[in-house]
């Protein structure tokens, strides 16, 4: 299969609500009409799939119903949002893009975005 460059930010800090967003950009060598995007988490040399979606160019990304990810596409950019993150989810999140159709098939894997998640401090009880 043919290789393709994928770019993503090096570091992202999740919001206090446990939401992190980043852009995954790929250098499409041709005019792909069908794309598959997968987010993988690498931590302690273990790689696990976080979510995956396919989309037709110009349409919304379709994630599984129980996915913690949402996303939109614009040209060769995919805007990804991961929700429900906690401190233990801190890790390297890698964007993988496959151009499924038309042939030839292209595969690109980004260097990863280090997402830092800080659990919010509980509000102290206040005496009135």
């Amino acid at each position: 299969c043919k290789a393709m460059h994928v770019a993503q930010p090096a570091v992202v800090l999740a919001s206090s609500r446990g939401i992190a967003s980043f852009v995954c950009e790929y250098a499409s060598p041709g005019k792909a009409t069908e794309v598959r995007v997968t987010v993988l988490r690498q931590a302690d040399s273990q790689v696990t799939e976080v979510c995956a979606a396919t989309y037709m160019m110009g349409n919304e990304l379709t994630f599984l119903d129980d996915s913690i990810c949402t996303g939109t596409s614009s040209g060769n950019q995919v805007n990804l949002t991961i929700q429900g993150l906690r401190a233990m989810d801190t890790g390297l999140y890698i964007c993988k893009v496959e151009l499924m159709y038309p042939p030839p098939y292209y595969l690109g894997i980004g260097n990863g975005t280090q997402i830092y998640v800080i659990d919010p401090e509980p509000c102290p009880d206040s005496d009135f």
């Epitope: 299969c1 997968t38 790689v47 696990t48 799939e49 995956a52 890698i94 993988k96 595969l107 894997i109």
Partner: nanobody, 119 residues
Framework: EVQLVESGGGVVQPGGSLRLSCAAS????????MGWFRQAPGKEREFVAD????????YYADSVKGRFTISRDPSKNTVYLQMNSLRPEDTALYYC????????????WGQGTLVTVSS
């Protein structure tokens, strides 16, 4: 060294069926994904189908959706491609491929098995 060996190719009439097999040997097989690609003479290599082994989730190219089925038998380290309602345009060399991890890419490839659909 991991080896992938395909079998099951042959000549079949339009509308017929074939079942391709891909057996992995020579290593440990906690593959992230296994898939099938094909290449017709003078054409680019094309994605056909894959299965992501942890979730058992399958994905198909539009051109084969509803006609081809990918499955696996972990106990035999084997992945299958059941091909029904074959068409002349399905004629190609079919390759099995394996992804050791989600970020490795398709590191392992078989030698291919030829499928010819002709009356």
């Amino acid at each position: 060294e991991v080896q992938l060996v395909e079998s099951g190719g042959g000549v079949v009439q339009p509308g017929g069926s074939l079942r391709l097999s891909c057996a992995a040997s020579g290593g440990t097989f906690s593959f992230y994904g296994m898939g099938w690609f094909r290449q017709a003479p003078g054409k680019e290599r094309e994605f056909v189908a894959d299965i992501r082994t942890s979730a058992g989730r399958t994905y198909y190219a539009d051109s084969v959706k509803g006609r081809f089925t990918i499955s696996r038998d972990p106990s035999k380290n084997t992945v299958y491609l059941q091909m029904n309602s074959l068409r002349p345009e399905d004629t190609a060399l079919y390759y099995c491929a394996a992804e050791p991890s989600g970020i490795s890419g398709w590191d392992y490839w078989g030698q291919g098995t030829l499928v010819t659909v002709s009356s």
